[in-house]
């Protein structure tokens, strides 16, 4: 289902998108992800805020928690204990970084319909979760981990050394949260809740980024974050496991780091429980081309964790970094020793492999000039995964099932032909034992979420079809969208072009390039969106193009690793190449071409504007990186190595925006940044502005006081209004 297109007879009733539509979120869509609690039951928060339990087999629904109870503590979120005796209610949500937040938690006893009194939880809590079985609670408060055997019991304190900005237990520090895990938690229950594993991050030696937060006070506050920039001292990580049944008996036991990893700076990348007495840890060298997966077993006699060298599996990249954006995680099979994992095959495409003893003897499960993206679930007889194989469009995602019980394994695409026009980009959510699953389709048509039988793949019901959105779009002149490819010098450049509703190839249109272009990213995706660029095409008559160049993902290692140790070169070249090809198509006004991007996209748009090609009349950089020496170690060094003389300092210096200050003289440049950006620090734009001033180059700038990397709230409206004025002025479009 595609939203209705323009027909001449309807032209009077149809209207273009307005900027107001976008800023009000008028055309936003809903998705439905069941909160699975068994093979055939799930919870969902209804529109009126009741917590409802659905039983798929009987078709019955039950309100297990009323909106009245939710409202009594102003709860915005909930979590049912696995034994279904208690529910935690979360309120006073206070955002910290990308994933982290603090909140107040109340425990509601379903048995008597009352809140648990006595031994209440402290506030605010940094993270809280139930054990996978029963109703034990683990939580993090003031950087320390606590355990409760039952919600009403007094807590047992597991760690004591937690200290703000110094030692983090059970939660990540800034860089692990953003660039490595990436989660708000760093603790993991074993499958039956016998053990609790957790990470301790020591940030004592990490340099601190400090910035002003202006607030309303007479004196601004200073925000201090231990933030390792490229080449700086990194957090020191240790992993511990504690027996939660007798936590005081031997206390937390440290899991040993593989010798080949411990010999120099390293990272912990993930922890996967296999059984209650077997755990799998993944480690990564600071130079991120070597990863080690280590399987450890509990030694009952010594009460310690043993990680034999024979259970160490090494993953190494000779052409780039290990993994895609992150090193993939293993999905263990029922024998509790073999596992499935996505990594590069000999042809340089990421595929599913089955590892039984050594990585060298891995059995390749999928293959082809496409990539396996995610393993959703492994059951006794099936493996469910997503890939971009179907019809050779890298920007699509379909869900496949491989039968692993039979030989040779047979493969079936579950989603390819379900709603072919409407749905080409899926994710999935599986119940226990994959008895049922939900499919969430993100486009290119209006998103739809459906429920399916895990054995037959039969659709059972529609969970969310966005009917209101469909009706609201009936009288809107939406732009047309095309996804195509350019073949240039043995490189395939996929692009998405967004065209005005009455597009006419014989006319000339202004062109706006929207770029992200970061390593292992993908912008050209078959997804639905009604956003700012939709408005620019619909109302302002612009053509907008997104191009996936070298360094982008899911098209093989040759394209992905092309940017290794050389950020800021090929990404920019490929945007420029694409623009030249677009001009050749004949409908672009080459005197009216602009480029804009945010974050990494702001870096690329800045470099493109300063490329000296004369292609771009103007451009915008929102919260750009300006020098890789200013950005986080974990991210930057993955792609650039270290900023040292004997490593890659030269390219760190060559790839700054500041080095090209002179080249901004002949373009209109709008530079935008939030002053409280914890991620890409305001320092980046401050340095660009300083270099432009020193070169006596005119430019426009806007800062957003106390705003972070997301520029949210009222700033969003101001931002898009401001950028719209800038582009309309650049393209000589009347207001």
């Amino acid at each position: 289902l595609r939203p209705s297109r323009v027909h001449n007879s309807e032209e009077n009733t149809m209207r273009a998108l307005t900027l107001k539509d976008i800023l009000n979120g008028t055309f936003s869509y809903k998705t439905f992800f069941p909160n699975w609690i068994s093979g055939q039951e799930y919870l969902h928060q209804s529109a009126d805020n009741n917590i409802v339990l659905y039983n798929i087999e009987t078709g019955q629904s039950y309100t297990i928690l009323s909106n009245r109870t939710m409202k009594s503590v102003n709860a915005s979120n909930y979590g049912l204990s696995p034994d279904r005796q208690f529910v935690y209610l979360e309120s006073d949500y206070s955002k910290l970084w990308r994933y982290s937040y603090t909140a107040t938690y109340y425990i509601y006893d379903l048995s008597n319909g009352e809140f648990v009194r006595g031994n209440e939880l402290p506030r605010p809590i940094q993270y809280l979760c139930w054990s996978p079985v029963g109703s034990k609670l683990a939580y993090v408060y003031q950087n320390n981990i606590y355990l409760k055997q039952r919600p009403g019991d007094p807590p047992f304190q597991i760690t004591f050394n937690g200290r703000e900005n110094k030692i983090f237990n059970g939660i990540p520090d800034w860089v692990y949260e953003e660039e490595m895990l990436p989660t708000k938690y760093a603790l993991w229950w074993s499958p039956n809740g016998k053990f609790l594993a957790y990470a301790e991050f020591n940030d004592k030696d990490i340099p601190v980024i400090a910035y002003s937060y202006y607030g309303d006070e007479q004196y601004p506050r200073t925000i201090n974050i231990p933030y390792p920039k490229a080449g700086a001292k990194n957090p020191v990580v240790r992993i511990f496991i504690i027996d939660t049944t007798y936590p005081a008996y031997v206390g937390p036991q440290e899991v040993p780091v593989p010798a080949m990893i411990a010999s120099s700076d390293y990272y912990f990348s993930w922890l996967t429980w296999v059984t209650d007495e077997r755990v799998c840890l993944q480690w990564l060298k600071r130079v991120q081309n070597v990863s080690v997966l280590s399987i450890c077993d509990f030694r009952e006699d010594w009460q310690t964790w043993d990680c034999p060298k024979t259970q160490e599996h090494i993953e190494e990249s000779r052409t780039g970094w290990a993994g895609g954006f992150f090193v993939s995680r293993p999905v263990f099979s029922y024998d509790a020793i073999s596992y499935y994992k996505i990594f590069s095959d000999k042809d340089g495409y990421k595929h599913i492999h089955y590892i039984k003893d050594t990585v060298e003897n891995a059995i390749q499960i999928t293959s082809g000039k496409w990539e396996a993206i995610n393993i959703f679930r492994v059951t006794q007889d099936s493996l469910f995964y997503s890939s971009n194989e179907f019809e050779e469009y890298p920007g699509r995602r379909n869900i496949y099932r491989i039968s692993i019980g039979s030989y040779p394994p047979s493969k079936k695409c579950v989603t390819c032909h379900l709603r072919k026009e409407r749905c080409q980009y899926y994710t999935a959510s599986f119940s226990d034992y994959a008895k049922y699953y939900a499919l969430v389709c993100y486009g290119p048509g209006i998103p739809i979420s459906t429920l399916h039988d895990g054995r037959t793949d039969q659709e059972i019901k529609i969970l969310e079809e966005n009917k209101e959105l469909e009706n609201a779009l009936k009288n809107i002149q939406l732009p047309k969208e095309e996804i195509k490819k350019l073949e240039v010098d043995e490189i395939t450049l996929w692009y998405k072009m967004i065209l005005p509703p009455q597009f006419d190839r014989s006319k000339k249109y202004p062109l706006l390039i929207q770029v992200y272009g970061g390593p292992c990213s993908q912008s050209v995706r078959s997804v639905f969106a009604v956003n700012w660029i939709s408005y620019l095409a619909s109302k302002e008559g612009m053509v907008i193009a997104l191009v996936d160049g070298r360094g982008t993902a899911f098209q093989g290692d040759k394209l992905l690793y092309a940017v290794y140790r050389k950020l800021g070169v090929y990404e920019v070249e490929d945007q420029i190449t694409a623009v030249r090809k677009f001009i050749e198509m004949g409908f672009i006004d080459e005197k009216r071409i602009a480029i804009w991007g945010w974050s990494y996209g702001g870096y690329v748009s800045s470099l493109a504007l300063a490329s000296g090609t004369g292609l771009f009349k103007c451009g915008i950089a929102v919260a750009p990186v300006s020098s890789w020496e200013y950005y986080a170690s974990v991210y930057t060094e993955r792609f650039m190595g270290l900023p040292t003389k004997d490593d890659n300092l030269e390219h760190y210096k060559n790839s700054t925006v500041m080095a090209r200050a002179e080249y901004f003289r002949n373009v209109d440049y709008l530079l935008i940044h939030g002053t409280a950006d914890d991620n890409v620090h305001f320092q980046n734009s401050a340095q660009i502005a300083k270099a432009l001033v020193n070169a006596q180059v005119d430019f426009q700038a806007m800062w957003y006081s106390d705003q972070n990397h997301g520029l949210s709230g009222l700033s969003t409206n101001h931002l898009y209004t401001h950028m719209t004025h800038f582009l309309k002025q650049c393209f000589s479009l009347s207001d």
Epitope: N55, T58, L80, Q85, S111, N112, G113
Partner: nanobody, 123 residues
Framework: QVQLQESGGGLVQPGGSLRLSCAAS????????MGWFRQAAGKERELVAA???????LYADNVKGRFTISRDNARNTVYLLSNSLKPEDTAVYYC?????????????????WGQGTQVTVSS
């Protein structure tokens, strides 16, 4: 171990009422969650209502406001009062018990069962 025996079923007109009873043996009745399930011909057995040891109740949304579950721990009995009965309420009604939470809607999660009592709603 708990034994359960239902009573009170029968034929009732649409719009009518019925009170089902379930008598339980065993001294620890008060510590069990109790539930009423029903099974119509050719259909899955479904939870209609449940009551926890602490007295909180759970109802299927399509019987909420019409059915009331209650328990009398002194008499080791659980009741299901059904008002405004409809033809689609026709089924065999079963009493079930389990230790722990009442908030389980799959019949396999309830280990103890009565024999069932037929309820027919028809004019």
């Amino acid at each position: 171990q708990v034994q359960l025996q239902e009573s009170g079923g029968g034929l009732v007109q649409p719009g009518g009422s019925l009170r089902l009873s379930c008598a339980a043996s065993g001294r620890t009745f008060g510590s069990y969650a109790m539930g009423w399930f029903r099974q119509a011909a050719g259909k899955e057995r479904e939870l209609v209502a449940a009551i926890s040891a602490g007295g909180s109740t759970l109802y299927a949304d399509n019987v909420k406001g019409r059915f009331t579950i209650s328990r009398d721990n002194a008499r080791n009995t659980v009741y299901l009062l059904s008002n405004s009965l409809k033809p689609e309420d026709t089924a065999v009604y079963y009493c079930a018990a389990r230790r722990g939470s009442a908030y389980y809607t799959n019949h396999i999660d309830w280990p103890y069962w009565g024999q069932g009592t037929q309820v027919t709603v028809s004019s």
